[in-house]
């Protein structure tokens, strides 16, 4: 049976959810007037970059859109972006597509996503509403790197 991505709504400890704004992801308060994205998550079959201590390697996409999260260096800084790509196209590739890969690690009831291309850089939300989802190497008070994956299936 062909693999299918798992679907989740994603939320942080301040009850901010991920929202698509144009071709960018931003954090916005969980509210009735805001349509949060449904995150597609599927494991990478290639084990080339695997590191069990860091978590399982996954691709992340936006359900209903041919958009996937990937990491690239812009002006010397690792940056989180959305690229037009179907998550299943990444999945069927025999070779791991490193820029699109994240280590998914569980910390208690939360999930943490670390870039495979840029070890030590994590997907994060700012404490301020309306700011883009970004990559950070500073885990702590000013940035939130722990997320709740809420099942929406």
């Amino acid at each position: 049976r062909e693999a299918a991505p798992k679907s989740y709504a994603i939320r942080d400890s301040r009850q901010m959810v991920w929202v698509l704004s144009g071709n960018s992801l931003i954090a916005a308060p969980l509210s009735r007037s805001i349509k949060p994205v449904t995150l597609h998550l599927i494991a990478c079959r290639d084990t080339e970059f695997s590191d069990k201590e860091k978590g399982n390697m996954v691709y992340l996409g936006i359900k209903g859109k041919d958009l996937c999260l990937f990491c690239a260096e812009i002006q010397g800084k690792p940056t989180l972006q959305l690229k037009e790509k179907n998550i299943m196209d990444l999945y069927v590739e025999k070779k791991a597509q490193k820029p699109f890969l994240f280590f998914h690690n569980k910390e208690g009831s939360t999930s943490v996503f670390q870039s495979v291309s840029y070890p030590g850089w994590f997907i994060a939300t700012s404490t301020t509403s309306g700011q883009p989802i970004f990559l950070t190497k500073e885990r702590g008070i000013t940035n939130n790197t722990n997320f709740y994956l809420d099942s929406v299936e």
């Epitope: 939320r11 308060p29 509210s31 009735r32 949060p36 709740y148 929406v152």
Partner: antibody
Framework: ELQLQESGPGLVKPSETLSLTCTVS??????????WGWIRQPPGKGLEWIGS???????YYNPSLKSRVTISVDTSKNQFSLKLSSVTAADTAVYYC??????????????WGQGTLVTVSS | ESVLTQPPSVSGAPGQRVTISCTGS?????????VHWYQQLPGTAPKLLIY???NRPSGVPDRFSGSKSGTSASLAITGLQAEDEADYYC???????????FGGGTKLTVL
């Protein structure tokens, strides 16, 4: 139909720990995207959120009470409980349990228990 | 002191329209978290009256309506009836507290 029922002693001595339980019927305490809260109301006063626990087991507490509050879930009994330590007369209130769903009631509480009066007195 | 501010009391004659305000800040209502309203009849538990700023749960009469703008919200009751006499509370979420916050409550008297 989801129903909540608070239970526990109606009288607690000063400096002791207040313990209350909320029994959930008509639904599961582990239901996806659900949060469960404790709210209190001192006699003649307004509502005060004490803290919450959600289906992931994550807890959130009112900063003004955080050092004294513990909220936990017993999935086998379909219950969640409140412990408030070192109580004083100021903790005398009607205590309510309530619930909501993240993507349906959007951080509001749509089902409430009927409340239980707890008096702190020696 | 409540995080959300409501007038302590409002009153109106039967058939009239009354509004109850709820003022917050940039970390709750102003941060675009929803406002919910509860009705508490004497001696009973609060009941959800409006959720998500302006939505009525089933069974709530359309005489009750909610709105939100900036850092404030309001509850309007039209065609006031004797049975509307109750305490009304607004509630939202505050990201700086990582928690739920209530208004101090407003006592509605039907004259």
């Amino acid at each position: 139909e989801l129903q909540l029922q608070e239970s526990g002693p109606g009288l607690v001595k000063p400096s002791e720990t207040l313990s209350l339980t909320c029994t959930v019927s008509g639904g599961s305490i582990t239901a996806s995207n659900t949060y469960w809260g404790w709210i209190r109301q001192p006699p003649g006063k307004g509502l005060e959120w004490i803290g919450s626990i959600d289906y992931t087991g994550s807890t959130y507490y009112n900063p003004s009470l955080k050092s004294r509050v513990t909220i936990s879930v017993d999935t086998s009994k379909n219950q969640f409980s409140l412990k408030l330590s070192s109580v004083t007369a100021a903790d005398t209130a009607v205590y309510y349990c309530a619930t909501g769903k993240y993507y349906e009631t959007y951080l509001g509480f749509d089902v409430w228990g009927q409340g239980t009066l707890v008096t702190v007195s020696s | 002191e409540s995080v959300l501010t409501q007038p302590p009391s409002v009153s109106g004659a039967p058939g009239q329209r009354v509004t109850i305000s709820c003022t917050g800040s940039s970390s709750n209502i102003g941060a675009h978290y929803d406002v919910h309203w509860y009705q508490q009849l004497p001696g009973t538990a609060p009941k959800l009256l409006i959720y998500g700023n302006d939505n009525r749960p089933s069974g709530v009469p359309d005489r009750f309506s909610g709105s939100k703008s900036g850092t404030s919200a309001s509850l309007a009751i039209t065609g006031l009836q004797a049975e509307d006499e109750a305490d009304y509370y607004c509630q939202s979420y505050d990201y700086s507290l990582s928690g739920y916050v209530f208004g101090g409550g407003t006592k509605l008297t039907v004259l």
